[in-house]
Amino acid sequence: KRFHDVLGNERPSAYMREHNQLNGWSSDENDWNEKLYPVWKRGDMRWKNSWKGGRVQAVLTSDSPALVGSNITFAVNLIFPRCQKEDANGNIVYEKNCRNEAGLSADPYVYNWTAWSEDSDGENGTGQSHHNVFPDGKPFPHHPGWRRWNFIYVFHTLGQYFQKLGRCSVRVSVNTANVTLGPQLMEVTVYRRHGRAYVPIAQVKDVYVVTDQIPVFVTMFQKNDRNSSDETFLKDLPIMFDVLIHDPSHFLNYSTINYKWSFGDNTGLFVSTNHTVNHTYVLNGTFSLNLTVKAAAPGPCPPPPPPPRPSKPTPSLATTLKSYDSNTPGPAGDNPLELSRIPDENCQINRYGHFQATITIVEGILEVNIIQMTDVLMPVPWPESSLIDFVVTCQGSIPTEVCTIISDPTCEITQNTVCSPVDVDEMCLLTVRRTFNGSGTYCVNLTLGDDTSLALTSTLISVPDRDPASPLRMAN
């Protein structure tokens, strides 16, 4: 069998491999050692017994989308059946005091690989044997502690594979300089040690995307905006736009990034090198926000001028399909597509990212102020309580609801929240009466709201002791 027979549904073409060469990966036309690494089709009954106590699930994630030329990282995490975990030695053990369907286990081990390797490795201390090899026959790398790594991960994409020895979690990074733009499929097959051979325990696949567009996301924040995710904002208050560039491999770290904004309200273009910008819309309506992000990033070098035409034919396919930044480029002859550009050329290319949103601007409550607080005289039966009247004004649209949140002096521990509808005239002047139980200092958050906005003001007030000699106190 060949790797593509084992790892994929369809044999990838040489064309696919040649056009997507991944540095350090191998062709899936290579032979797979089926004696050491048995191959089971989906639905094979042997899968049921591939792991003690249930099935292992592999979860494959990536930090896709990746800007072409950057690195994309894939992570595989193994999820074991209930009550099982990997210990510090790489063995699979039962968690203490954890009950599964089989009850508590007397044997602490699900798989005691340490004992197996100590007992059965007659290798004259070399640490190498015919079975400590990957499916293509390459020997395991002998990192310190490699014997505690009991899972073999085979990654497969674009007609190539990459083998990795690991524990219950592994990561693999791939440079995308030579990857065709668009969605691609990564497949991973996981094997575990089993005596002097290996047993498949999980298969997983995931789509990743390589793009020549900078992946851009914009968060928008506006004070008093009731719902920041509905792209409806308030007139006459600044909106803060914050641009997030998805660049997990820091490919653009040394790039100068320019942000070109068009807010759609005839205020012209605004160009900045800052990822945040504030803009205030002064009219109601619907506006088309457009952002173009530009970064000079490492990129392909333009082809050299064609050499003088030879009189005799030259070998075909003299092209560059290896990574420009490959640290260890193999000889050009390794490859049906020869290297015809200098690997360490450092060229720049402008990369662009785009973000577009439709923003709705409406009237809202712009500001709220407490202009007066008055201690209301209470009848004698309630000596412990104080009533305070807050006289409040607002600007902007007319509120429909008022809420007061009474907290401790640090404004952290809420003691009481009261909301009530309000009926306010166009002058926007209202009195809010609230009860305070006992003397002391309180933090009062007062909000006025309508459908689209929520305006807040805060104050600290001191409620004095009730003194019959001074029944009425003004709060400060």
Epitope: R11, P12, S13, Y15, T180, D212, S316, L337
Partner: antibody, heavy 119, light 107 residues
């Protein structure tokens, strides 16, 4: 929708060069390799080579190596194929064709450009 | 280079009858084989890719089969509009190569 529009017919003398253009629209130009295929009158299809508009990598069929040059103008989403040292057997219809992702089959073709080489 | 041998060179079939075209490759290209239809004065039109996958909008009377080095295009019930030249193409490796073509006519 995807469209590939080629330049008009050409008549050339032996020894001369011809440059055929193929203007692409309806898709992200830099995302797909563009190929050139020719067809002599009454004959079959013959692959000449391909170019990646993203980085201008090229692969040429051995038969045309040294005589063909494929180039790109990203600003106009146009691919060019120049064939030099023309001879009478180069008389053919020249097609540009777009591959699909990692697969070299052609769902989209230009309308073809007839190049006649005659003294 | 991978050599493509198409047979027969021409084929005359009655309307409504089955037409079968064969394509043999000089090495295993499975499943990277496509079929095209070409009518006079027009560019080729993709029918089948990856040996058996029908391209969008292609009538289901066209089907592809085969693996390894032997592939077949079948028109299950020939229609008048199917009169054309049919080409196979391997998309397994560069240089891409085409079969010599099969001319399909109505008997």
């Amino acid at each position: 929708q995807v469209q590939l529009v080629q330049s008009g017919a050409e008549v050339k003398k032996p020894g001369a060069s011809v440059k055929v253009s193929c203007k692409a629209s309806g898709y992200t130009f830099t995302s797909y390799w563009m190929h050139w295929v020719r067809q002599a009158p009454g004959q079959g299809l013959e692959w000449m080579g391909e170019i990646n508009p993203y980085d201008q990598r090229t692969n040429y069929a051995q038969k045309f190596q040294g005589r063909v040059t494929m180039t790109v103008d990203k600003s106009t989403s146009t691919v060019y194929m120049e064939l030099s040292s023309l001879r009478s057997e180069d008389t053919a219809v020249y097609y540009c064709a777009r591959s699909t992702g990692n697969y070299a089959w052609f769902a989209y073709w230009g309308q073809g450009t007839l190049v006649t080489v005659s003294s | 280079d991978i050599v493509m041998t198409q047979s027969p060179d021409s084929l005359a079939v009655s309307l409504g009858e089955r037409a079968t075209i064969n394509c043999k490759t000089s090495q295993d290209v499975s499943p990277s084989l496509a079929w095209y239809q070409q009518k006079p004065g027009q560019p080729p039109k993709l029918l089948i890719y990856s040996a058996s996958k029908r391209y969008t909008g292609v009538p289901d009377r066209f089907s592809g089969s085969g693996s390894g080095t032997d592939f077949t295009l079948t028109i299950s019930s020939l229609q008048a509009e199917d009169v054309a030249v049919y080409y196979c193409q391997q998309h397994y490796s560069i240089p891409l190569t085409f079969g010599g073509g099969t001319k399909v006519e109505i008997k």
